[in-house]
Interface confidence: low
């Protein structure tokens, strides 16, 4: 016997209190698949999160981070503070890259300069806090 709830499309829920009729998801909730018996509460992008995509009856809201922060984790589950290029985020806050390392982004950690001599090449352009070394011909 077919489950009558299987006829309920995304954006609705199968309301057992009302003879298994397909009822629309209430505001601020959604169902992304058919046949659901409840609608899920929409994610709210608050504080350091901002709304990238509004919640609809069939899909959850999507958040990103306010300026000065960037997303971390699946679905932007966390916002992490940006640093300047040439810095990395530590427990003590943003710190300049140590000599011999660089970071050309506002996120992530400082990486060591390319060691040109390992490939038998000369250094064409020296590395800085913000950029990698550029190797010349051997």
């Amino acid at each position: 016997l077919q489950d009558p709830c299987s006829n309920c499309p995304a954006g609705t829920f199968c309301d057992n209190n009302r003879n298994q009729i397909c009822s629309p998801c209430p505001p601020n909730s959604f169902s992304s698949a058919g046949g659901q018996r409840t609608c899920d509460i929409c994610r709210q992008c608050k504080g350091v999160f901002r709304t990238r995509k509004e919640c609809s009856s069939t899909s959850n809201a999507e958040c990103d981070c306010t300026p000065g922060f960037h997303c971390l984790g699946a679905g932007c589950s966390m916002c992490e503070q940006d640093c300047k290029q040439g810095q990395e985020l530590t427990k003590q806050g943003c710190k300049d890259c140590r000599f011999g390392t660089f970071n050309d982004q506002k996120r992530g950690i400082c990486q060591p300069w390319t060691n040109c001599s390992l490939d038998g090449k000369s250094v064409l352009v020296n590395g800085t806090k913000e950029s990698d070394a550029v190797c010349g011909p051997s």
């Epitope: 309920c8 629309p24 998801c25 505001p27």
Partner: antibody, heavy 117, light 107 residues
Amino acid sequence: QVQLKESGPGLVAPSQSLSITCTVSGFSLTTYAISWVRQPPGKGLEWLGIIWPGGGTNYNSALKSRLSISKDNSRSQVFLKMNSLQTDDTARYYCARGAGTWYFDVWGAGTTVTVSS
Amino acid sequence: DIQMTQSTSSLSASVGDRVTISCSASQGISNYLNWYQQKPDGTVKLLIYYTSSLHSGVPSRFSGSGSGTDYSLTISNLEPEDIATYYCQQYSKFPWTFGGGTKLEIK
């Protein structure tokens, strides 16, 4: 630009059936629901039914036995069929887009159907 | 079925007036209420959804409020183009139902 346009026969004889088409543009029927609403002359609005993006339907219980709503996503058309028409089915018939499924954010201009012999 | 009652079928007001149109449900509808405007030519537009959320492009002079069974639409500064019939609609339970409408005229 989002638009809905109803097209119907204008005149229907009593006991015959009614077919109205709602042709939409500017959005896809795979992501929006469409409802049908009618308005008899000098009276208020009456909700007839809805067809969901996935093709499921809900109907006004008072008219359910006479009503059928279907659609063709590829042609962007929704169809209202009503049988056993009587004179009190004379009305302007509207299709409306269901945004978020629970409110009608864009309406067609309506098509007038007169049931008379 | 849930009955929606708009107790005032018509009302007359002057340009600049504050006008309130009421709507009552036969049972609680948990704020699941919309308001529509129908112009004399039959054109229908959404004004307010979920009791108090203003639809995009609708002037801010329109506002909605209410809870339980009693709801209202307020036009704070009546303009000549607001001549229309206003309908409430519940979507708490199928079949979705409309109020009988309130026809607004300018004095």
